[in-house]
C-alpha cells in the first residue's frame, strides 16, 4: 500500500513539475525590466526564451519573436536546449510511469517489469528536473552578469550631454516557476525510484532440499540461499528480506498481482 502511494504521489508530483517546466519554457517573463533606481518610463520591457515583449502604460503590448538562430547568444540557445531536453525526458518519463503504476493493470505484466519501468521513469524525472534547474540557473547567472555590466555602464557612460536610458533586466516570474517545477520533478523522480525498490519482486523461496553426497554432506538450498556444509546450521528456510513473500512454512491466502485493478 505504501509503495503504491509513494509511486502515485511521485507520479503526481512529477506531472505537476513537468507542467511547470513546460509553462516556464513558454512564458515571456524570464527577464523583466528592473524598475529600481531607474527613470520611471511609460513602457515595461520583458523577455522570454522565444520572444521579447514591451507593455506600454496605455495597455498595448507588443511581442517580437527571435526570428534568428545564429544571431542569438550561445547561452540562450543552451538554456532553450536544456529546457526542451527536460520537457522531452519528462514527457517520456510520464508515459513510461503511467504503464508502471501499480494501480493500473496491463495484460499480465510482471511486477519486475513494473519495477524496471518505475525506475526508468524515476531516473528520467530526475534528469528532467536537473535539466530545468540547470537551464534556469544558467539564465539567472547570465542576467546577474549583464545586470552588473549595465550598472557599470550607467555610471561610466555619462560623459556625453545626451543621456540614454539603460534598460537593466532582473529575474522574471518564469525563473521562479522553473526552479520550483524542476525541484518538483526531481522530488517526483526520487519518489519513483524509492517506490521501485518496494515493487521489485522477492526471489521465490522454496523448502530446503538436502542432497546427500558420498564423502561429506552438502545441503543445497535453492532460492538464493548460500549452500552450507553440514546439517545443523541452516535446515530451516530463512528469508533474505521480508518483502511480503511467504515461505512454505507460512502458507496462507495472499492476494496475487492479478487481484489488483
Amino acid at each position: 500500500m505504501a509503495v503504491t502511494a509513494c509511486q502515485g504521489l511521485g507520479f503526481v508530483v512529477s506531472l505537476i513539475g513537468i507542467a511547470g517546466i513546460i509553462a516556464a519554457t513558454c512564458m515571456d517573463q524570464w527577464s523583466t525590466q528592473d524598475l529600481y533606481n531607474n527613470p520611471v518610463t511609460a513602457v515595461f520591457n520583458y523577455q522570454g526564451l522565444w520572444r521579447s515583449c514591451v507593455r506600454e502604460s496605455s495597455g498595448f503590448t507588443e511581442c517580437r519573436g527571435y526570428f534568428t538562430l545564429l544571431g542569438l547568444p550561445a547561452m540562450l540557445q543552451a538554456v532553450r536546449a536544456l529546457m526542451i531536453v527536460g520537457i522531452v525526458l519528462g514527457a517520456i518519463g510520464l508515459l513510461v510511469s503511467i504503464f508502471a503504476l501499480k494501480c493500473i493493470r496491463i495484460g499480465s505484466m510482471e511486477d519486475s517489469a513494473k519495477a524496471n519501468m518505475t525506475l526508468t521513469s524515476g531516473i528520467m524525472f530526475i534528469v528532467s528536473g536537473l535539466c530545468a534547474i540547470a537551464g534556469v540557473s544558467v539564465f539567472a547567472n547570465m542576467l546577474v552578469t549583464n545586470f552588473w555590466m549595465s550598472t557599470a555602464n550607467m555610471y561610466t557612460g555619462m560623459g556625453g550631454m545626451v543621456q540614454t536610458v539603460q534598460t537593466r533586466y532582473t529575474f522574471g516570474a518564469a525563473l521562479f516557476v522553473g526552479w520550483v517545477a524542476g525541484g518538483l520533478t526531481l522530488i517526483g523522480g526520487v519518489m519513483m525510484c524509492i517506490a521501485c525498490r518496494g515493487l521489485a519482486p522477492e526471489e521465490t523461496n522454496y523448502k530446503a532440499v538436502s542432497y546427500h553426497a558420498s564423502g561429506h554432506s552438502v545441503a543445497y538450498k535453492p532460492g538464493g540461499f548460500k549452500a552450507s556444509t553440514g546439517f545443523g546450521s541452516n535446515t530451516k528456510n530463512k528469508k533474505i528480506y521480508d518483502g511480503g513473500a511467504r515461505t512454505e512454512d507460512e502458507v496462507q491466502s495472499y492476494p496475487s498481482k492479478h487481484d489488483y485493478v
Epitope: A42, V43, V54, S57
Partner: antibody, heavy 117, light 113 residues
Framework: QVQLKESGPGQVAPSQSLSIACTVS????????VHWVRQPPGKGLEWLGV???????NYDSALMSRLTISKDNSRTRVFLKMNSLQTDDTAIYYC???????????WGPGTTLTVSS | DIVMTQSPSSLTVTAGEKVTMSCKSS????????????LTWYQQKPGQPPRLLIY???TRDSGVPDRFTGSGSRTDFTLTISSVQAEDLAVYYC?????????FGAGTKLELK
C-alpha cells in the same frame, strides 16, 4: 464612436480648489488610460497627469503636490482635482485618451478655467 | 524632466512647399526592448483641441494624409510636410511619451505667406 467631454466650474477664486470631470463614451476606462493636458491662453500644451486603465497615476513633477486624478466607480468619468489655484492656472483643460505609443489619440473639446478674484 | 526643444518657433511658407520642423529631446526616447522611439507629433488648429498625427516617431495615425512624415531616432526628430496645403496651417507639437512626466515641446507655428 469615441468621445470625451470636460465639464468644469468656469471660474474659480485664487487659493480655492478645482474639480473638473471628463465624461467618456465609446470606450471603457478599464481598458484605456486618460490624460489631462492644459493650455494657458496663447501658450503651448502642458501635460498634467494620467490615470491608467489599472488605476495607477502619474503626474507632472511641478504640479504633483497639488494634483489628484481619479476615476468614478461607474467607470465613465475621470476627475481632475487641483488645490491652491493661482492666476497662472488659468487655461483650457483637456482630457484625452491614450493609445499606441502612449500617444493621445482622442481629445475632448476642452473646458476653460479662469482663476480670478 | 525631459526637455523637448522645437525649432523653428514659427515658419512662414507658401502652398505646395516642402516643410521640415525639428524636435530635440534632452534624453533618448528610444526603447531598447522594441527599438521604437516614443515621440508623438500633434497638430493644433486655432480654437480646436490637438489632433494626433504621428506616434512612435514615424507611424501615421489613421486618416492622416501621407504628406506628413515623421523621422529621426533617439534625441533628434523631424516632421516633414511634403507639400503644404492651406488646411495644414496650425501649431505642431512634439511630445515625449517615454519617460515621465510626458512633456511637450513649445510648438512650431506654421503660417502662410
Amino acid at each position: 464612436q469615441v468621445q470625451l467631454k470636460e465639464s468644469g466650474p468656469g471660474q474659480v477664486a485664487p487659493s480655492q480648489s478645482l474639480s473638473i470631470a471628463c465624461t467618456v463614451s465609446g470606450f471603457s476606462l478599464s481598458s484605456y488610460g486618460v490624460h489631462w493636458v492644459r493650455q494657458p491662453p496663447g501658450k503651448g500644451l502642458e501635460w498634467l497627469g494620467v490615470i491608467w486603465a489599472g488605476g495607477s497615476t502619474n503626474y507632472d513633477s511641478a504640479l504633483m503636490s497639488r494634483l489628484t486624478i481619479s476615476k468614478d466607480n461607474s467607470r465613465t468619468r475621470v476627475f481632475l482635482k487641483m488645490n491652491s489655484l493661482q492666476t497662472d492656472d488659468t487655461a483650457i483643460y483637456y482630457c484625452a485618451r491614450s493609445l499606441y505609443g502612449n500617444s493621445l489619440d482622442s481629445w475632448g473639446p476642452g473646458t476653460t478655467l479662469t482663476v480670478s478674484s | 524632466d525631459i526637455v523637448m526643444t522645437q525649432s523653428p518657433s514659427s515658419l512662414t511658407v507658401t502652398a505646395g512647399e516642402k516643410v521640415t520642423m525639428s524636435c530635440k529631446s534632452s534624453q533618448s526616447l528610444l526603447n531598447s526592448g522594441n527599438q521604437r522611439n516614443y515621440l508623438t507629433w500633434y497638430q493644433q488648429k486655432p480654437g480646436q483641441p490637438p489632433r494626433l498625427l504621428i506616434y512612435w516617431s514615424s507611424t501615421r495615425d489613421s486618416g492622416v494624409p501621407d504628406r506628413f512624415t515623421g523621422s529621426g531616432s533617439r534625441t533628434d526628430f523631424t516632421l516633414t510636410i511634403s507639400s503644404v496645403q492651406a488646411e495644414d496651417l496650425a501649431v505642431y507639437y512634439c511630445q515625449n511619451n517615454f519617460i515621465y512626466p510626458l512633456t511637450f515641446g513649445a510648438g512650431t507655428k506654421l503660417e502662410l505667406k
